[in-house]
């Protein structure tokens, strides 16, 4: 978990801080959204359960050329124990519904905030 705070992290980041930083970034995305996020790109919906971070990254990494979510993609890579590349779907067990990136971010944010409030940081 050493890279979760971005490139300037001085050392290991506590899991609670890493999760908080991810929540903050998603809040910023949703609050600063003026035009459709990522031009209305669609991504695979995910199950917000075990393996959620890798699944979220696998879904979002297929969105290219969207600077608004680049930091989120980097942060999610710190939560996912394996390397994820575009077109990889090992954690996306069910690929049957596509939703807009904006809705994906909102759903993910709600779930992460619940985990944070419950004290589930890992």
């Amino acid at each position: 978990l050493t890279c979760l705070g971005g490139f300037a992290s001085p050392g290991p980041v506590p899991p609670s801080t890493a999760l908080r930083e991810l929540i903050e970034e998603l809040v910023n995305i949703t609050q600063n959204q003026k035009a459709p996020l990522c031009n209305g790109s669609m991504v695979w919906s995910i199950n917000l359960t075990a393996g959620m971070y890798c699944a979220a990254l696998e879904s979002l990494i297929n969105v290219s050329g969207c600077s608004a979510i680049e930091k989120t993609q980097r942060m999610l890579s710190g939560f996912c124990p394996h390397k994820v590349s575009a077109g990889q779907f090992s954690s996306l067990h069910v690929r049957d519904t596509k939703i807009e990136v904006a809705q994906f971010v909102k759903d993910l944010l709600l779930h992460l905030k619940k985990l944070f409030r419950e004290g589930q940081f890992n």
Epitope: T17, R20, E24, Q31, K113, R117, E118
Partner: antibody, heavy 123, light 107 residues
Framework: EVTLRESGPGLVKPTQTLTLTCTLY??????????VDWIRQPPGKGLEWLAH???????RYNPALKSRLTISKDTSKNQVVLKLTSVDPVDTATYYC???????????????WGQGTLVTVSS | DIQMTQSPSSLSASVGDRVTISCRAS??????LNWYQQKPGKAPKLLIF???MKPRGVPSRFSGSGSGTDYTLTISSLQPEDIATYYC?????????FGGGTKVEIK
């Protein structure tokens, strides 16, 4: 207008269970992002956070008192109840309930407080 | 638990003076620092949240600053109605913890 009102027994005997009720006005604990905290303040001393409960029934406690505390809510009455078991004279304090909101970042800032209820633990 | 240390524990200043109260956390709290004002016999009132943000109705003479472990509450021009005890509180990590308070009096 947002208001919180605490009610309690005033006097409790050592070893008994203290039950405090916080009634909420002007907002509902069934609304997303709403939470209620309990804080206490011994006479002439500082503030100590005890517990909180969120709209979706997520509960958190101060580890130092966790084994003695239970927080719950009754959405139909718009009330939050705190129980503190095995009370001791050191639990003598003014007990406050306060509202917290998590609409954006989770600040854990208490923006509205009740007037407080003084509880004395004595035989 | 994160320890919050406030200084000074009390101060006396004249009306119109600039007053600063310090709060130090035992570890980085990432700006999750809130300030409360408690007047004698009353409940605390939220003055500042997230280091520098103000709820509606808080006078402009109150401001907050800081980062990492060190935070400051400033009253730019002390008024008689500012006689109170001021508490800092960290909201970064549970359990939530408060500073010991700073009692502000008028000279």
């Amino acid at each position: 207008e947002v208001t919180l009102r605490e009610s309690g027994p005033g006097l409790v005997k050592p070893t008994q269970t203290l039950t405090l009720t916080c009634t909420l006005y002007g907002f509902s604990l069934s609304t997303s992002d709403m939470g209620v905290d309990w804080i206490r303040q011994p006479p002439g001393k500082g503030l100590e956070w005890l517990a909180h409960i969120w709209w979706d029934d997520v509960k958190r406690y101060n580890p130092a008192l966790k084994s003695r505390l239970t927080i719950s809510k009754d959405t139909s009455k718009n009330q939050v109840v705190l129980k503190l078991t095995s009370v001791d004279p050191v639990d003598t304090a003014t007990y406050y309930c306060a509202r917290t909101v998590s609409s954006g970042y989770i600040y854990y800032a208490m923006d509205y407080w009740g007037q407080g209820t003084l509880v004395t633990v004595s035989s | 638990d994160i320890q919050m240390t406030q200084s000074p524990s009390s101060l006396s200043a004249s009306v119109g003076d600039r007053v600063t109260i310090s709060c130090r956390a035992s570890q980085d709290i990432r700006n999750y620092l809130n300030w409360y004002q408690q007047k004698p016999g009353k409940a605390p009132k939220l003055l500042i949240f997230y280091t520098s943000m103000k709820p509606r109705g808080v006078p402009s003479r109150f401001s907050g600053s800081g980062s990492g472990t060190d935070y400051t509450l400033t009253i730019s021009s002390l008024q008689p109605e500012d006689i109170a005890t001021y508490y800092c509180q960290q909201g970064n990590t549970l359990p939530l913890t408060f500073g010991g308070g700073t009692k502000v009096e008028i000279k």
